[in-house]
Amino acid sequence: EVEKTACPSGKKAREIDESLIFYKKWELEACVDAALLATQMDRVNAIPFTYEQLDVLKHKLDELYPQGYPESVIQHLGYLFLKMSPEDIRKWNVTSLETLKALLEVNKGHEMSPQVATLIDRFVKGRGQLDKDTLDTLTAFYPGYLCSLSPEELSSVPPSSIWAVRPQDLDTCDPRQLDVLYPKARLAFQNMNGSEYFVKIQSFLGGAPTEDLKALSQQNVSMDLATFMKLRTDAVLPLTVAEVQKLLGPHVEGLKAEERHRPVRDWILRQRQDDLDTLGLGLQGGIPNGYLVLDLSMQEALS
C-alpha cells in the first residue's frame, strides 16, 4: 500500500505523459487521477515507467474498478498486463478477440504464464467453445496450446475449428488428446478428395481406429514412417502385412530401422513370419509357420 499524501503544488497530472516517469511512487499515487489513467491507458505502454511505477498505476486501477476492469481498459493494458495476477484476471469479462490479441502480443516470446493461461481460460469459457478464429489466434502465439488442453476441454472444439490447426500445433499431443481430435478432423475434412484429405488428416492419425487405417491403405497414400510410428498400437496390431505395405507404399522399407520400436515391434509379433518375409526386409520375430494363431481378444469378447 502506498501512503495517502497530498499532491505537491503544480504536480497534478493533467495528461498521462512522459513527465510522469520522474515522479516518485508516492507522487504518482497522489497526483494521477485514476479516471484519467483509465481513459488514457493507451499512452501508458509508450512511456518508460519502471515496474514499481507500474505497480502504483495498477493499484489506482484496482481501486477504481474493485469488481474487475472494463474491457475498454483491458484492451489498452499493454505491459501493465504482466503485472496482473490470475486472481485479477478472473474478475474480467473479455469478449473481444482484439483484446485477447493485444494482451497476447504483450506476452509474445515469453513462456505461457499463469496470467495468460487464466486469460485464455476466461476468454474461451466466455465464448462457450473454442471457435476457429480463437484457435487461430491462440496457436499463432502458442503452437503447443491445443496440446495443453485436457481431452475434456478439447471436446468443446467444434469440427469447423480444426481447419485452423497446423501440424506443429499437434507435436506435443498425447494419444488421449488425439483420440478426441481425430473424429473432429475426420468430420471437418470429409468432403475432400483422397490425396488432399490425407495431407490434412495425417497429423491427427494418432487417434485413428483400425478400420480407418485399413480404408487409407486402399488409397495409395504412402504414409511416412514418422506418421506410422505415432499411430495407436492397438489400431496397428490388426493390420495385415499387405495392408501395412499398401499404407506405407515406398516407405515400407523404413520398417526395418524401426523393428525394435513400438508400434512396429508389437505388430511384427502378431504377423506370420512367412507374410513378413514377403516384404523382403529381413524382419524377424513373427509367428513361425505352422503355428496356430488364437485371437484372444475375440475369445474374451465372446465370454
Epitope: 512522459e18 516517469i21 520522474f22 509508450a46 512511456i47 518508460p48 515507467f49 519502471t50 515496474y51 514499481e52 507500474l54 505491459y79 504482466l82 506476452n107 516470446g109 515469453h110 513462456e111 504464464s113 499463469p114 496470467q115
Partner: antibody, heavy 117, light 107 residues
Framework: QVQLVESGGGLVKPGGSLRLSCAAS????????MSWIRQAPGKCLEWISY????????YYADSVKGRFTISRDNAKNSLYLQMNSLRAEDTAVYYC??????????WGQGTMVTVSS | AIQMTQSPSSLSASVGDRVTITCRAS??????LAWYQQKPGKAPKLLIY???GLQSGVPSRFSGSGSGTDFTLTISSLQPEDFATYYC?????????FGCGTKVEIK
Amino acid sequence: QVQLVESGGGLVKPGGSLRLSCAASGFTFSDHYMSWIRQAPGKCLEWISYISNSGSTIYYADSVKGRFTISRDNAKNSLYLQMNSLRAEDTAVYYCARDQRNAFDIWGQGTMVTVSS
Amino acid sequence: AIQMTQSPSSLSASVGDRVTITCRASQGIGSWLAWYQQKPGKAPKLLIYAASGLQSGVPSRFSGSGSGTDFTLTISSLQPEDFATYYCQQSYSNPLTFGCGTKVEIK
C-alpha cells in the same frame, strides 16, 4: 547496502553444464524483476534473460533459448541461471542485474564462465 | 531485434573537455534508452534512464537527451574518473539490446 553477488562460474567443457547464482541483499528482492547479462572478453554487453518478481514471466534471448533456464527463490533472495549444452561462444563474464524495466540499476560484480576443451 | 549503433567507437579527450557520445536505434524506441559507464574489470554502472533521467548519485555533469532513434550522452566537463567505456541500451522491446560502447581515453 544494496548489493548483488554472483557465484558459480568456472571452467567447463563444451556440452557441459553450470549453474550460476546471484545473492541479493539490501532491497526487497521479491519486488523486483531480475536479468542476466553477459560480456564476452573484449566484446559488447549481451542481455540474455529476465524473470518477473513472482517468477511467472520469463524471457530469453534467442542465443540461449532452450539451453539456459532462469529461476529465482524469493525466500532465499536468490536468482539462478542453469546453463546446459554450453558452447565456446558462451564464454563470458555473467552479470545479474536488477531490472527496473527502463534500465538495469544495480549490477553484480560478475562471474567468469569459460567453455573450453 | 533492434540494433543500437554508438559513435564514435573511441575518442580522446582532456580533463575539462565537453564530451558528446551518440547512440542510434535501428527503429524508433521512444524514450526507452539507458546509458551506462564501465571501467576495466568492473560491472557497468547506470548513469541515465528513460533517455534523460539522471540516476540517483550520478554527478550532474552527465546528461542525456533525445527520443525516437537518436540519443546523446553529454559529459559537460570531463573529470579524471570519467575515463571509461560508455554503453547505450534500449528496453523498448525484447530482446533488450546494447550498443557496442564508446571508449573515452585520455588525450
